[in-house]
Amino acid sequence: ALDTNYCFSSTEKNCCVRQLYIDFRKDLGWKWIHEPKGYHANFCLGPCPYIWSLDTQYSKVLALYNQHNPGASAAPCCVPQALEPLPIVYYVGRKPKVEQLSNMIVRSCKCS
Amino acid sequence: ALDTNYCFSSTEKNCCVRQLYIDFRKDLGWKWIHEPKGYHANFCLGPCPYIWSLDTQYSKVLALYNQHNPGASAAPCCVPQALEPLPIVYYVGRKPKVEQLSNMIVRSCKCS
């Protein structure tokens, strides 16, 4: 699987999950989140050659088409597969609230 | 929705479904499919700016990150959303067989 265990410990050139730290204030302009100040969101990057973690029958076909037509702009793309939530603390007035923001952290990628 | 109805009738620059015809023999090297000789597979293409058909909370965050960091390689990607099957005819010797190949045609796209 193209997950953090594999991707973070390898020098994989093809589609894989990459490290990305997002600072809520600096990178998103969000001031409402009190904790954490930022988080390891990660992102997906890398080419999707034939047979590289292809998502559907269509992505197999498209990767194969791309192999036969290397100049074509039609190609599968490396996108998130498994996402995890992020617990955050924000304030309503002086009252802290805990919330789970769903689908915030990329754990693995796929070619779609 | 970024579907064929909207995308094929517009000059949309952002993520949208685009027309692509695939010839089974020429583009894939498949000789075993008798009918059709090829099909309109379509593909997804175009940038994914903030709020453009974003798939998850993560893709919203990433698009926003990208807006704040325009040079970053981390950005959502335009990928298939709705896929449809393709009925095909292949031969087992002289005997024709009908099969549905699932997830073969792109009907709409999303930013993931």
Epitope: I51, L64 | W30, K31, Y90, V92, R94, K95
Partner: antibody, heavy 120, light 108 residues
Framework: EVQLVQSAAEVKKPGASVKVSCKTS????????ISWVRQAPGQGLEWMGG????????NYAQRFKGRVTITADESTSTTYMELSSLRSEDTAVYYC?????????????WGQGTLVTVSS | ETVLTQSPGTLSLSPGERATLSCRAS???????LAWYQQKPGQAPRLLIY???SRAPGVPARFSGSGSGTDFTLTISSLEPEDFAVYYC?????????FGQGTKLEIK
């Protein structure tokens, strides 16, 4: 270069199952149909079935139906032939071969063969 | 299933001679569903002819195939020492694919 590389020889007891693998070069796996043929010692050739790896559509010879399963693993470009309820008459060299492109077709590239011996 | 009968069972000839191998099908195969293979001891079969008469890539011109319907022939115009082997015909018109029992071509 086109190559089909098969797994090593196996010795099995009657009633057991055997799974023979056939690793192919990517292009063959993507575009062709893989057939399995066996040859008992000193005997002729017998077709067991075949698979279209890309879509996992399999076709079997009637006499092996229910006993043979042919599958494909795209991540490794490998095709597998599993034969169950083995009996002594299943002792043979098992070959994988790529067809010229159709489901039933002539076979242009062959693996080196895997000897399966069924003996108590 | 389609039964293929090859004749003769064994053919004894000398290098330089012409070899004619026959394959008869129990039902019509049309004109393009027959192949011929060569097999040497301890080796996998090698495709010689497909579609009854088309030579596979890399196969010498001395090998030729002919026939349609139920009667097919493999001809080796002038035998070379490396041609002595077992030859099989194969039909792929109908499932299951079937092979002939083989013709052994031996040096006289």
């Amino acid at each position: 270069e086109v190559q089909l590389v098969q797994s090593a020889a196996e010795v099995k007891k009657p009633g057991a199952s055997v799974k023979v693998s056939c690793k192919t070069s990517g292009y063959i796996f993507i575009s062709n149909v893989i057939s399995w043929v066996r040859q008992a010692p000193g005997q002729g050739l017998e077709w067991m079935g075949g698979v279209i790896p890309i879509v996992d559509i399999a076709n079997y010879a009637q006499r092996f139906k229910g006993r043979v399963t042919i599958t494909a693993d795209e991540s490794t470009s490998t095709t597998y032939m599993e034969l169950s309820s083995l009996r002594s008459e299943d002792t043979a060299v098992y070959y994988c071969a790529s067809t010229l492109g159709l489901v039933l077709d002539a076979m242009d590239y062959w693996g080196q063969g895997t000897l399966v011996t069924v003996s108590s | 299933e389609t039964v293929l009968t090859q004749s003769p069972g064994t053919l004894s000839l000398s290098p330089g001679e012409r070899a004619t191998l026959s394959c008869r099908a129990s039902q019509s195969l049309g004109s393009s569903y027959l192949a011929w293979y060569q097999q040497k001891p301890g080796q996998a079969p090698r495709l010689l002819i497909y579609g009854a008469s088309s030579r596979a890539p890399g196969v010498p011109a001395r090998f030729s195939g002919s026939g349609s319907g139920t009667d097919f022939t493999l001809t080796i115009s002038s035998l070379e020492p490396e041609d002595f082997a077992v030859y099989y015909c194969q039909q792929y018109a109908d499932s299951p694919i079937t092979f002939g029992q083989g013709t052994k071509l031996e040096i006289k």
